[in-house]
Amino acid sequence: LIIGFGISGRHSITVTTVASAGNIGEDGILSCTFEPDIKLSDIVIQWLKEGVLGLVHEFKEGKDELSEQDEMFRGRTAVFADQVIVGNASLRLKNVQLTDAGTYKCYIITSKGKGNANLEYKTGAFSMPEVNVDYNASSETLRCEAPRWFPQPTVVWASQVDQGANFSEVSNTSFELNSENVTMKVVSVLYNVTINNTYSCMIENDIAKATGDIKVTESEIKRRSHLQLLNSKAS
């Protein structure tokens, strides 16, 4: 969480951002909030990116003002106009690119004053893993697959019964480049599994951490997976 305060002239206002990550090819949100102001016509929201000459986005007098927008963001940005009234200046970024990573500034002007805060935006690819029993294998084998990751992640297996055990000797992980030549499909196979145990396949890079769990018993198979973005720090 980054909290910024205004500078010079008018009073300062508090602006708060949250570091976040974008999944390339999908839409992302750059979070920014400010002290709401009743005089809506005076609210100006500017998004800037370090190293980029033009603006990322500008909202003023109740509408988008995109004449100064940088070419790389053309047609890809929007603020949530109905949320500006409650002090939400978050930016929606469509079709996130790897090159969108960097330091952004959310700069706000209201009738009460000015303020800004920076935001670190990471980009990459992350997806939920799915763990299945591989019935084609000669021994009891689990297969963990996740369709899109970048940068290349690490994959670690764990088990509820054998806590702390190192499964690197009985697992094999491969990374297959996807058709767009950036992201990769992750496939990890775990051998010699036992029934009545819960296994977890953990995939992690510097952007996200995802876990796929599978519990295999005589009568059923239960699966669960979750994904967590790392470094979501507010500022």
Partner: antibody
Framework: QVQVVQSGAEVKKPGSSVKVSCKAS????????ISWVRQAPGQGLEWMGG????????NYAQKFQGRVTIIADKSTRTAYMELSSLRSEDTAVYYC?????????WGQGILVTVSS | EIVMTQSPATLSVSPGERATLSCRAS??????LAWYQQKPGQAPRLLIY???TRATGIPARFSGSGSGTEFTLTISSLQSEDFAVYYC?????????FGPGTKVDIK
């Protein structure tokens, strides 16, 4: 000096509609949101919805969705709130106010009585 | 929607005494909270916004504090004209919601 002036009291039959108006002086219209808040006899305040003329946005409380319409006429600096399918529980004082997100100037209120 | 609750429902205070009114939100509203005063037969009047900023023309005896989910309105020394109903209102999220009110009456 900002002034918010509302239309007069109304008596309506159940099932009918009521349309009340609110005229704001100064630059209120182009620069601020206009909201409608009602208060049933002896009860608290209830935000019904609001309009942001400069953003071209209206927002209504879920409870009134489909029954309430708020519009604004920038040329006359007047906002209107229409509530349809009236029932006895809609008997209340209806206030027009400048804002949100919070409300700094209020009209005098209009008593709308729904009775057969 | 965010539900606002206020306590106590009624507060009996003698003139000159201090009155402390509480408001609680069902989830964090940061500092996006306003307080209003309403006297019988009158429209509400804005006292405080931003949890602690006094509105124009509001006497210094009124002060607001708190953030997140817990808020307080304090009237340091009650005057006869302060006996009224007080409402809190959140504006963190649509729809804007009010508390049920606290009636401050003469002890």
């Amino acid at each position: 000096q900002v002034q918010v002036v509302q239309s007069g009291a109304e008596v309506k039959k159940p099932g009918s509609s009521v349309k009340v108006s609110c005229k704001a002086s100064g630059d209120t219209f182009s620069n601020y949101a206009i909201s409608w808040v009602r208060q049933a006899p002896g009860q608290g305040l209830e935000w019904m919805g609001g309009i942001i003329p400069i953003f071209g946005i209206t927002n209504y409380a879920q409870k009134f969705q489909g029954r309430v319409t708020i519009i604004a006429d920038k040329s006359t600096r007047t906002a209107y709130m229409e509530l349809s399918s009236l029932r006895s529980e809609d008997t209340a004082v209806y206030y027009c106010s400048r804002g949100g997100p919070y409300f700094d100037y209020w009209g005098q209120g209009i008593l709308v009585t729904v009775s057969s | 929607e965010i539900v606002m609750t206020q306590s106590p429902a009624t507060l009996s205070v003698s003139p000159g005494e201090r009155a402390t009114l509480s408001c609680r939100a069902s989830q964090s509203v940061s500092s996006n909270l306003a307080w209003y005063q309403q006297k019988p037969g009158q429209a509400p009047r804005l006292l405080i916004y931003g949890a602690s900023t006094r509105a124009t023309g509001i006497p210094a005896r009124f002060s607001g504090s708190g953030s997140g989910t817990e808020f307080t309105l304090t009237i340091s020394s009650l005057q006869s004209e302060d006996f009224a109903v007080y409402y809190c209102q959140q504006y963190k999220k649509w729809p804007f919601t009010f508390g049920p009110g606290t009636k401050v009456d003469i002890k």
